[in-house]
């Protein structure tokens, strides 16, 4: 149940996909990855106001309880709903190989 | 890749399963749910310090980039890794029915 996509906080303030440029050094991968030298990391960033992109019933409950008990129950959080695969060329004990990672780059986002 | 379960912030401070007691009124369900009158809502609450219960490679990247760019990239967030099903007795147009919800109660938690 993907709820409202209208952000009440203003354009671009709510949970959505962002791209962050990162080097192998930034990611702590320089000792085991050869390529790429830089990654366009897609990640989910932004606020999750009431029912905005609620992933499921749990997210709706969380919103309700956060409104009642904000010090106890956090607001829903902006996280990946799905991922895009990515390949890395990496060093291994047996040499260089290509490895596909399915859980590295966010494809789209929701609140949970 | 479920990383370290040791919480560096002290016992109970990191991402884990919490139970919050909530009435139908609290949840905004009073007009369509008959039973239960109260729900023991299990949800994921707590901090996600470096590599604590990292759900996947994306969570590890997020940790690295949060350390570098804390104002741009948020820390990973404590969310359900899986759910426990729950039944609700609910009012419908044709009377009362039993409905199972698979995405209502968190079963265990991870950081993403």
């Amino acid at each position: 149940a993907r709820n409202g996509d209208h952000c009440p906080l203003g354009p671009g303030r709510c949970c959505r996909l962002h791209t962050v440029r990162a080097s192998l050094e930034d990611l702590g991968w320089a000792d085991w990855v050869l390529s790429p030298r830089e990654v366009q990391v897609t990640m989910c960033i932004g606020a999750c106001p009431s029912q905005f992109r609620a992933a499921n019933m749990h997210a709706q409950i969380k919103t309700s309880l956060h409104r009642l008990k904000p010090d106890t129950v956090p607001a829903p959080c902006c996280v990946p709903a799905s991922y895009n695969p990515m390949v890395l060329i990496q060093k291994t004990d047996t040499g260089v190989s290509l490895q596909t990672y399915d859980d590295l780059l966010a494809k789209d986002c929701h609140c949970i | 890749a479920r990383n370290g379960d040791h919480c560096p912030l002290g016992p109970g401070r990191c991402c884990r399963l919490h139970t919050v007691r909530a009435s139908l009124e609290d949840l905004g369900w009073a007009d369509w749910v008959l039973s239960p009158r109260e729900v023991q809502v299990t949800m994921c609450i707590g901090a996600c310090p470096s590599q604590f219960r990292a759900a996947n490679m994306h969570a590890q990247i997020k940790t690295s980039l949060h350390r570098l760019k804390p104002d741009t990239v948020p820390a990973p967030c404590c969310v359900p890794a899986s759910y426990n099903p729950m039944v609700l007795i609910q009012k419908t147009d044709t009377g009362v029915s039993l409905q199972t919800y698979d995405d209502l109660l968190a079963k265990d938690c991870h950081c993403i």
């Epitope: 790429p36 895009n84 695969p85 990515m86 390949v87 060329i89 | -």
Partner: antibody
Framework: QVTLKESGPALVKPTQTLTLTCTFS??????????VGWIRQPPGKGLEWLAH???????YYNTALKSRLTISKDTSKNQVVLTMTNMDPVDTATYYC??????????WGQGTTLTVSS | DIVMTQTPLSLSVTPGQPASISCRSS???????????LYWYLQKPGQSPQLLIY???NLVSGVPDRFSSSGSGTDFTLKISRVEAEDVGVYYC?????????FGQGTKLEIK
Amino acid sequence: QVTLKESGPALVKPTQTLTLTCTFSGFSLSTYGIGVGWIRQPPGKGLEWLAHIWWNDNKYYNTALKSRLTISKDTSKNQVVLTMTNMDPVDTATYYCARLAYDYVDSWGQGTTLTVSS
Amino acid sequence: DIVMTQTPLSLSVTPGQPASISCRSSKSLLHSEGITYLYWYLQKPGQSPQLLIYQMSNLVSGVPDRFSSSGSGTDFTLKISRVEAEDVGVYYCAQNLELPPTFGQGTKLEIK
């Protein structure tokens, strides 16, 4: 297991247009970092890079042949198509497609042999 | 385009003996980030080329460790410590510092 297979005519006449298809399996051309390239090898000679296409639809053409080449992909069919116009006998060669991952060219097709002759 | 020049163009080696192939580029292949964009391929008789060496000195997984590669910015050497019958074919050096990627003219290795 990664496999690539080139298909196309064995013979074309001068001035005609060549269409080659690379059909692949074992990887997806929607994966970040992945591309498919075309390379040719005239009989008894070395390798020449023609063109490549990336997961994000960025394309590269060898400058010397750019006006004659078009590369495209159909991700759902796992195919990459190269067209080459105004064929000439000097274009007689074995044409290979290959999988790229950034600068890592690790899997090649078996090649398709083309003769340009009237 | 960067020109790659190989020597010798053919080589006949007794099994168990070492072999060495040289490659020279018309421009330094050492990038400012410290990577040398030089590659070695082997095309066995009747087959398509296979990658042996990645970024000058990294052996590809599955390639026997009797193969090694070294060099500077413009002068490179592929060495086979003990030639075996399965090593016959045409060896190509290639560069990928600049587009288009370009190949040497090839060195044919035969067994005596």
